[in-house]
Interface confidence: low
């Protein structure tokens, strides 16, 4: 019967070359000789000269390597005519599918990939994913089916296993608990992409995961007590700086400071604000303090942050103890 | 390999203004920030401010607020500082400088090789 | 504005000595220091930052220390590269300041 089931040519074939394929044969060759050829790219027309045909045998030849990367599958017509050149077959369609080879390495995407996560998150969380492209077939096999995996961690603080990767999807997680921007605020990670769902040639990259900040340090009083001396009636007046640390990132809204009078200013004597760049605690007295009618103020102050806590921290509290200075005031008659 | 590429040398006139480019190349310009620092001739270096490209948001010193505007075009990667009224004090080297994001934490890792103002009439 | 003081303002060190140079700062700045070195017609390069922390590339030799408000730069064994001009600079708040310059000098 004239016809052709597809053929299946590994590429990068050793050869010897021509090697014979398949045969082209028509039952018309009874009593008369049979002429064969094959047309279309690959054949007649660009890439020329891939294929050709006996043209007595009919035996179709492959001239040379395939590669599956540049052409996946030939698509050629065979055909058969009589010495005096009149066709005694229909055109017949001869499929070439070229099979793959694990001739390519898997590449990534990029040399560096950069991601980031909040400090303090659960495990679970993704970071980011990576990608790795392998030219090889990932369909009808392994070749370019691309396993990826963490080859290393630096720092390997709190320990070497805080992070993960799906073996498949390249999505990086967190597994481990004890992310803290404080100590450790970037991580490098080198990781592997390994073809053959993870039995071939690997590649490297890095992956940098960025912790960002959360706010998981309190503001600390230091140091906690204060004492101070104020004249009677100036208002406006610089009490006293406070200071605090924060270990968050400086000059974000978790380390900005925002203070609080909780006790001692019955009458509304004083105020405090924070100062942008040093953030420390700026009391000043938002009216006049009578001397004769209290010489002596103490001041129960807490911080905070401009942003809530992320999780139950205590906050701290500053004692201010002031004194109020007499003056030598006009008599009243 | 990242780099930093600045424009070239400029000579100005006094009262004129003055735009200087640098291009980065080789990491993730939106996401880090860029700084300008000014050197006088046979002095020290002076921190003028800062752009991150993902959003715009500039941070300058007080010492330049006028005088120093700072721009990026994230589509080229490049970052620019405009200086205007220009003195004779604003004769100096300009450097760029890239540092990582968050905060403040990162020191300026990657410099450009600096861009010469002289202001003369 | 923080204030930073960079000690000595010149030093003259010979191939394969030790020297350290100093910066002190009016407020705390815990561990954010930074330490270039110029050398004449080049940009800055950063050797170290966050105090004591190798920037990519630079030799061992270098080592950084210091927190709060007392920081120091120390190079081991000098090298013929190692000569020009050293500064310090506040990467903790603003505006980011630099230390005046030591300039180390082949005597």
């Known amino acids: 019967e004239w016809v052709m089931p597809p053929i299946f040519v590994p590429e990068n074939g050793k050869g010897p070359f021509p090697q014979r394929l398949n045969q082209l044969k028509s039952n018309k060759d009874r009593g008369t000789k049979i002429f064969y050829s094959i047309t279309g790219p690959g054949a007649d027309s660009p890439p020329e000269g891939v294929f050709a045909v006996e043209k007595e045998t009919g035996w179709l030849l492959l001239n040379k390597p395939l590669d599956r990367e540049e052409i996946a599958k030939y698509e050629l017509f065979g055909h058969a005519v009589s010495e005096n050149g009149a066709s005694v077959e229909d055109p017949m369609n001869i499929s070439i599918i070229v099979t793959d080879q694990n001739d390519h390495k898997p590449k990534f995407t990029q040399d560096t990939f950069r991601g980031s996560v909040l400090e303090g998150v659960l495990p679970g969380t993704s970071v980011m994913q990576v990608t790795a492209t392998d030219e090889d077939d990932a369909i009808y096999t392994y070749n370019g089916v691309v396993a990826y995996s963490i080859h290393s961690q630096e720092p390997k603080d709190p320990h070497d296993l805080m992070f993960t990767i799906h073996r498949s999807t390249g999505t990086i997680s967190v597994i481990s608990s004890g992310l803290d921007r404080e100590k450790v605020p970037e991580y490098t990670l080198t990781i592997q992409a390994t073809d053959m769902d993870g039995d071939g040639s690997t590649t490297t990259a890095v992956a940098v995961v960025e912790i960002l900040d959360a706010n998981d340090n309190a503001p600390m009083f230091d140091p906690q007590k204060y004492e101070a001396h104020v004249p009677e009636n100036a208002v406006g007046h610089e009490v006293q700086r406070l200071t605090v640390t924060d270990l968050d990132a400086p000059n974000s809204p978790a380390w900005r400071a925002t203070y609080l009078i909780m006790g001692g200013d019955d009458g509304d004597h004083f105020t405090i604000t924070t100062h942008p760049e040093s953030n420390q605690g700026i009391l000043t007295t938002r009216k006049g303090l009578d001397f004769e009618a209290k010489n002596q103020h103490t001041l129960y102050v807490e911080v905070t942050n401009e942003a809530p806590f992320v999780l139950k921290l205590p906050t701290s509290t500053a004692t201010i103890v002031v004194h109020v200075e007499d003056v030598n005031e006009a008599p009243v008659f | 390999v990242q780099l930093v590429e600045q424009s070239g040398a400029e000579l100005v006139k006094p009262g004129a203004s003055v735009k200087i480019s640098c291009k980065a190349s080789?990491?993730?310009?939106?996401?880090?920030?860029m700084n300008w620092v000014k050197q006088r001739p046979g002095k020290g270096l002076e921190w003028i401010g800062r752009?991150?490209?993902?959003?715009?948001?500039?941070k300058y010193n007080g010492k330049f607020k006028g005088k120093a505007t700072l721009t990026a075009d994230k589509s080229s990667s490049t970052a620019y500082m405009q200086l205007s009224t220009l003195t004779s004090e604003d004769s100096a080297v300009y450097f760029c400088?890239?540092?990582?994001?968050?905060?403040?934490?990162?020191?300026?890792?990657?410099w450009g090789q600096g861009t010469s103002v002289t202001v003369s009439s | 504005e923080l204030q930073m003081t960079q000690s000595p303002a010149s030093l003259s060190a010979s191939v394969g000595e030790t020297v350290t140079i100093t910066c002190r700062l009016s407020?705390?700045?815990?561990?954010?220091l930074a330490w270039y070195r110029q050398k004449e017609g080049e940009s800055p390069q950063l050797l170290v930052y966050?105090?004591?922390t190798l920037a990519e590339g630079v030799p061992s030799r270098f080592s950084g220390s210091g927190s709060g408000t007392q920081f120091s730069l120390k190079i081991n064994s000098l090298q013929p590269e190692d000569f020009g001009n050293y500064y310090c600079?506040?990467?903790?708040?603003?505006?980011?300041?630099f230390g005046a310059g030591t300039k180390l000098e082949i005597k």
């Open positions: 400088a890239r540092q990582r994001d968050y905060g403040a934490l990162y020191a300026m890792d990657y």
């Open positions: 080789g990491y993730a310009f939106s996401s880090s920030w």
């Open positions: 752009i991150y490209p993902g959003d715009g948001e500039t």
């Open positions: 407020e705390n700045i815990y561990s954010y």
């Open positions: 966050n105090s004591k």
């Open positions: 600079q506040n990467h903790y708040g603003f505006p980011f300041t």
